[in-house]
Each structure stands twice: as structure tokens, then as C-alpha cells.
């Protein structure tokens, strides 16, 4: 009886794993084996596919074959018993195009209100992604184990920290990789769960802001308790992208080591041009806080995006605010030749209820104020360019009293 050639051959490539699956064409014939040949582009001869010779099952692995993953190859299969079937040719394919990104490896660390996620490619030193290692981005889905309500976080790198979590709570997450340059989305990792710790005695510092004064950077933050010491560290932001290395060499800012105030001043020349991450930690001598949220700090933007300067003309029921260019050292105005929008926050001096106005114009009216009442105003500038989505720090607050009722305009 003539053997029929196998049909429906599927090629599955995940990272560097090459798997072939096929259907037997005749289930009734026993003790049949299967063999594959392959052919590279521009070659006439067929070569035996190692790992896929005389296979008794309907699956084989040819990962050991060192192929150029960008080069098209063709496969053929036949069945063998006493005689052989005719060859069945599989459509030619390019391994890289066909490959899927496998599940990444995930390593979790817990704090009281944060989880640190370290992500590595599933296959170490992968041949398939050798040229794309630094282009991987990841996305994750996270949920509280008790609720199952999912939150998606897109476009993260090999180290990501999720803040504002609840203490003593189990969170679960899964991560997948993407190569946006090749339109490839990977498969999810297994689900990993971790429990946040009991609440720490000392909270981390909050609301870290960087501003420029003269030739110095001024770093400010808020803290709940007095009589603390603080330290500040920095890291090159691009190091978060490094896929294989999870040793992050945070560096001290010398002028911000063991400072006793909630700010520190250091020369601009501490940092070369670039994008950095900054973090702050508090200590009371016995206990230490976890690190603050990491803020991104771009020396280029920081150098030119200064808080706006403004004047207030007070009326009985409104303020007119006139925004001018920020001043540099020596009181010279800074020319900012890119479009800005202004965020103006105002509040009654005796209340914490803030109201906000967003305005493109440099003359702004703050309406609906009460007569003879002290209001405070602060403002900051935002770039309108989407690629350069940056904000200045807030200006210092200016407080003014509105005029008595029915003041003429």
C-alpha cells in the first residue's frame, strides 16, 4: 500500500524554540516515522533537518539548527515505513517573521505600598532577538487577588515600580513583551503574586520637585515628620531599559547626603546633559523609609522650562493675572520660543480647596471671587509639544486681597 504524505504542517517559533507539528494522513497505518529536509534560499539541494529525522510522533524540535533567522527557508516532510511517501512541501518562511515573543521572566519585590517588577526576556541571549534586545517594551495586567479588578499598564521597561498600593495585600500580575518595531506582541508570563508588607513606620518622602536657581538645581520634597535626615540618589534613566542586567547602580548626590532639611541645592554641573531618575529616602536615625517615587529629571528641559512670573490686579470679584517670562539670574527674562500653556491654581487663604484654570493666553481672569478676601495664586508652565511633554515647577504662591464690593472695573 502506498504511504500518503503527511499534511497540515505547522511551524511554531517562540523565541529560539522551533517546533514542527503535522497530521498523519493515514491513522490506520502503524509504525510510521517521519523525516524533514530543509532548503535555504538560493540553494538547490535539500539537507536533512537534524532533530526531525525518523520521528515516531507528530511533533519535532529543530531548535539546535543554527539558522540565519532573517533568511527564508523551505521545509519538506515525508512518511516512511518499508517504503516512503512522496514529499510534502511546506510554504517557505522567514523565521524572524514567523517568530513569537515568549513569556518574559518576572521577578517581584514587595514594599508596604509598592511592588518592584524586574522583567527579563524569557530566553537569555536569544539569537532571534539579538538585534532587538534593547527595543523590548513590556505591558502588564495587575489586580488585587481579593477583587480581580484588572489594571493595565503599557509601555514599561525591564524595571518598573508600582506605587500607591495597600499594605498587607496580595497583588497578582502577568507580563508580556512587545517589539513595536516589528509589530510583534508576545505571550503573557505565568501569573505571579506577591503580598505587600505591613505598613512601614516611616512613610517615603513625597512631591519631589526640581527647579533651577542661578547655576544650581534645587530639589524640594515634602515630609510628614520633623527632625529627619534625607539622602538623594540618581540613576541614568536609560538603565531601566537594560534587559539582562538587574543591578541598578544608583549614585549619591554628594550635597544631598544626610541633609536635615526637605530640600537640597547642588551645582548644575553635577549632571551632564541627559535624563535621570531621582529618589529620596528619609531616616530618623533608627528607622529608614522606603525610597520615594522616582521622578524623571531632564537636564535639557529643566534648564529652560522655568516657572512663570506673574502680576495680579485685584478687583472685588476677580483677579486679572498677567503672565510674563521667567527671570534668570541677573533679573534678565528668559526667552522661551515654544508654545506654553499655563496652569493657574488659586485658593482662599483660609481654606485648602484649590481651583484650577488652564489657559494659553498670558492674561487670565480668575472669576467668582468674594470681596475683601485673601486669595493665593501659584502657576506653572507646560510645553504644548506632545514629544516634549514637560512641566515647570510651580511658582511661589502670591497672596492678594480682593477689593471691597462694587469696585469699578
Amino acid at each position: 500500500k502506498n504511504l500518503k504524505s503527511p499534511q497540515k504542517v505547522e511551524v511554531d517559533i517562540i523565541d529560539d524554540n522551533f517546533i514542527l507539528r503535522w497530521n498523519r494522513s493515514d491513522e490506520s497505518v502503524g509504525n510510521v516515522t517521519f523525516s524533514f529536509d530543509y532548503q535555504k534560499t538560493g540553494m538547490d539541494n535539500w539537507i536533512k533537518l537534524s532533530g526531525c529525522q525518523n520521528i515516531t510522533s507528530t511533533k519535532c524540535n529543530f531548535s539546535s539548527l543554527k539558522l540565519n533567522v532573517y533568511e527564508e527557508i523551505k521545509l519538506r516532510i515525508r512518511a516512511e515505513k518499508e517504503n516512503t511517501s512522496s514529499w510534502y512541501e511546506v510554504d517557505s518562511f522567514t523565521p524572524f517573521r514567523k517568530a513569537q515573543i515568549g513569556p518574559p521572566e518576572v521577578h517581584l519585590e514587595a514594599e508596604d505600598k509598592a511592588i518592584v517588577i524586574h522583567i527579563s526576556p524569557g530566553t537569555k541571549d536569544s539569537v532571534m532577538w539579538a538585534l532587538d534586545g534593547l527595543s523590548f517594551t513590556y505591558s502588564l495586567v495587575i489586580w488585587k487577588n481579593s477583587s480581580g479588578v484588572e489594571e493595565r499598564i503599557e509601555n514599561i521597561y525591564s524595571r518598573h515600580k508600582i506605587y500607591k498600593l495597600s499594605p498587607e495585600t496580595t497583588y497578582c500580575l502577568k507580563v508580556k513583551a512587545a517589539l513595536l518595531t516589528s509589530w510583534k506582541i508576545g505571550v503573557y508570563s505565568p501569573v505571579h503574586c506577591i503580598k505587600t508588607t505591613v505598613e512601614n513606620e516611616l512613610p517615603p518622602p513625597e512631591n519631589i520637585e526640581v527647579s533651577v536657581q542661578n547655576q544650581n538645581y534645587v530639589l524640594k520634597w515634602d515630609y510628614t515628620y520633623a527632625n529627619m535626615t534625607f539622602q538623594v540618589q540618581w540613576l541614568h534613566a536609560f538603565l531601566k531599559r537594560n534587559p539582562g542586567n538587574h543591578l541598578y547602580k544608583w549614585k549619591q548626590i554628594p550635597d544631598c547626603e544626610n541633609v536635615k532639611t526637605t530640600q537640597c541645592v547642588f551645582p548644575q554641573n553635577v549632571f551632564q546633559k541627559g535624563i535621570y531618575l531621582l529618589r529620596v529616602q528619609a531616616s530618623d536615625g533608627n528607622n529608614t523609609s522606603f525610597w520615594s517615587e522616582e521622578i524623571k529629571f531632564d537636564t535639557e528641559i529643566q534648564a529652560f522650562l522655568l516657572p512663570p512670573v506673574f502680576n495680579i490686579r485685584s478687583l472685588s470679584d476677580s483677579f486679572h493675572i498677567y503672565i510674563g517670562a521667567p527671570k534668570q539670574s541677573g533679573n534678565t527674562p528668559v526667552i522661551q520660543d515654544y508654545p506654553l500653556i499655563y496652569e493657574i491654581i488659586f485658593w482662599e487663604n483660609t481654606s485648602n480647596a484649590e481651583r484650577k484654570i488652564i489657559e494659553k493666553k498670558t492674561d487670565v481672569t480668575v472669576p467668582n471671587l468674594k470681596p475683601l478676601t485673601v486669595y493665593c495664586v501659584k502657576a506653572r508652565a507646560h510645553t504644548m509639544d506632545e514629544k516634549l511633554n514637560k512641566s515647570s515647577v510651580f511658582s511661589d504662591a502670591v497672596c492678594e486681597k480682593t477689593k471691597p464690593g462694587n469696585t469699578s472695573k
Partner: antibody
Framework: EVQLQQSGAELVKPGASVKLSCTAS????????MHWVKQRTEQGLELIGR????????KYAPKFQVKATITADASSNTAYLQFSSLTSEDAAVYYC???????????WGQGTTLTVSS | DIVMTQSQKFMSTSVGDRVSVTCKAS??????VAWYQQKPGQSPKALVY???YRYSGVPDRFTGSGSGTDFTLTISDVQSEDLAEYFC?????????FGGGTKLEIK
């Protein structure tokens, strides 16, 4: 294969100085931290300090700030620990250790025994 | 500095038993804890990092657990070659401090 080869045992007089070495193979020390750890007989492990061989930045445990100096030579893939004004309290086994992923001490040298005696 | 306390200096166990070595931190260290094994006359060997992750090549009878201030290294099926001293270490605040060690004796 990752290996940390430490220099041989030292017998030195009180008041003298000594420099211990640790040569790494199987990895580039610039990509890691190199730590030194002290262990006295029947006592625990004490961290002396570390160096980032990439830029030479060092950090010491407070009690070793004056006593110890850690250096590194990236070109020979070697880290060093120098001790000054030795006393009998400094007699111990000293380990050099690689600070790997997530800051953990993943590979240890075989140790160097330092004896301080007149 | 953070103090790591291993309250049991010695523990006695038999081959095949399950034993738990404990370690307490003087403040919340998250999950930033490692465990090391030091056999007589040898240098320490890394077993567990980030409280619960085993290094490759470490037998799966070694399991780390805990977070915050309380940590445990469990050996589920003690073998004669597990005769050693076990140290915990915090790796969150420099200087990274070690526990005083727990010597495991096999009956």
C-alpha cells in the same frame, strides 16, 4: 564560569599595612559591585564596604571607614582591600564577593586568612 | 544600621526531617533578604534572594519565605550534606547586614 581568586594567606605584624587582592574571571567587574566581607573565627559575617569598579565610587560600613580602603583595577579585573594600622582585632578571613542582580551577593571568593602577630 | 537577628544559634535535626531557620529584621526590609549556606572550612554559598527566589542549582528542598521583618529558610527533607551554618542578610539599606548565623547539626 564565574570565579573569584583571592590572594594567599598573610602573616603581618601589628601596626603594619596589608593589601589583599581578588581577581575575577568569567565576568567583567565593571558590570557589578565588588564587596569585601570579614569573618572572624566562630563569629558572623561583617560587611566592610564595596566599590563600583566602573567609576571607583566606594561605600563603607561606618566602623571600617578609617581602617579600610577598597580599590579596583578594571583593566586587570581585580579588586583590592587595603588595611592600615593592623591590630589583633583585624585577624580574620576576608572574602571578596560579587554584588549581582538585585544587589545580592551571588559569588564568593575562597577567602584570605589574615593573621596579625608580632 | 539594620540589625538581623537569628535567635537560634544551633538547631539539631535528623536526615529526612523538615527544619525552619528564622531571621528577624529590626525594621521593615520589604522582601530584600538573602540566605547563605556556609559549610565547615568553605566560603558562603548563595541559596535564596529576594526572600523566596532560589538560585539556579540550589535543590528545591530549600525554600525561603517571609516579608517585612520576619523571614524563614525551610529545608524540607534534610540531607547529611546540609550540615552547615545558615546566614540571612538584608540588602535594602547599606551597609547590608548579616544575621549572626544558625548552625544546623545532623543527629
Amino acid at each position: 564560569e564565574v570565579q573569584l581568586q583571592q590572594s594567599g594567606a598573610e602573616l603581618v605584624k601589628p601596626g603594619a599595612s596589608v593589601k589583599l587582592s581578588c581577581t575575577a574571571s568569567g565576568f567583567n567587574i565593571k558590570d557589578y559591585y565588588m564587596h569585601w566581607v570579614k569573618q572572624r573565627t566562630e563569629q558572623g559575617l561583617e560587611l566592610i564596604g564595596r566599590i563600583d569598579p566602573e567609576d571607583g565610587e566606594t561605600k563603607y560600613a561606618p566602623k571600617f571607614q578609617v581602617k579600610a580602603t577598597i580599590t579596583a583595577d578594571a583593566s586587570s579585573n581585580t579588586a583590592y582591600l587595603q588595611f592600615s594600622s593592623l591590630t589583633s582585632e583585624d585577624a580574620a578571613v576576608y572574602y571578596c564577593v560579587r554584588g549581582g542582580n538585585f544587589y545580592y551577593f551571588d559569588f564568593w571568593g575562597q577567602g584570605t586568612t589574615l593573621t596579625v602577630s608580632s | 544600621d539594620i540589625v538581623m537577628t537569628q535567635s537560634q544559634k544551633f538547631m539539631s535535626t535528623s536526615v529526612g526531617d523538615r527544619v525552619s531557620v528564622t531571621c528577624k529584621a529590626s525594621q521593615n526590609v520589604g522582601t530584600n533578604v538573602a540566605w547563605y549556606q556556609q559549610k565547615p572550612g568553605q566560603s558562603p554559598k548563595a541559596l535564596v534572594y529576594s526572600a523566596s527566589y532560589r538560585y539556579s542549582g540550589v535543590p528545591d528542598r530549600f525554600t525561603g519565605s517571609g516579608s517585612g521583618t520576619d523571614f524563614t529558610l525551610t529545608i524540607s527533607d534534610v540531607q547529611s550534606e546540609d550540615l552547615a551554618e545558615y546566614f540571612c542578610q538584608q540588602c535594602i539599606n547599606y551597609p547590608y547586614t548579616f544575621g549572626g548565623g544558625t548552625k544546623l547539626e545532623i543527629k
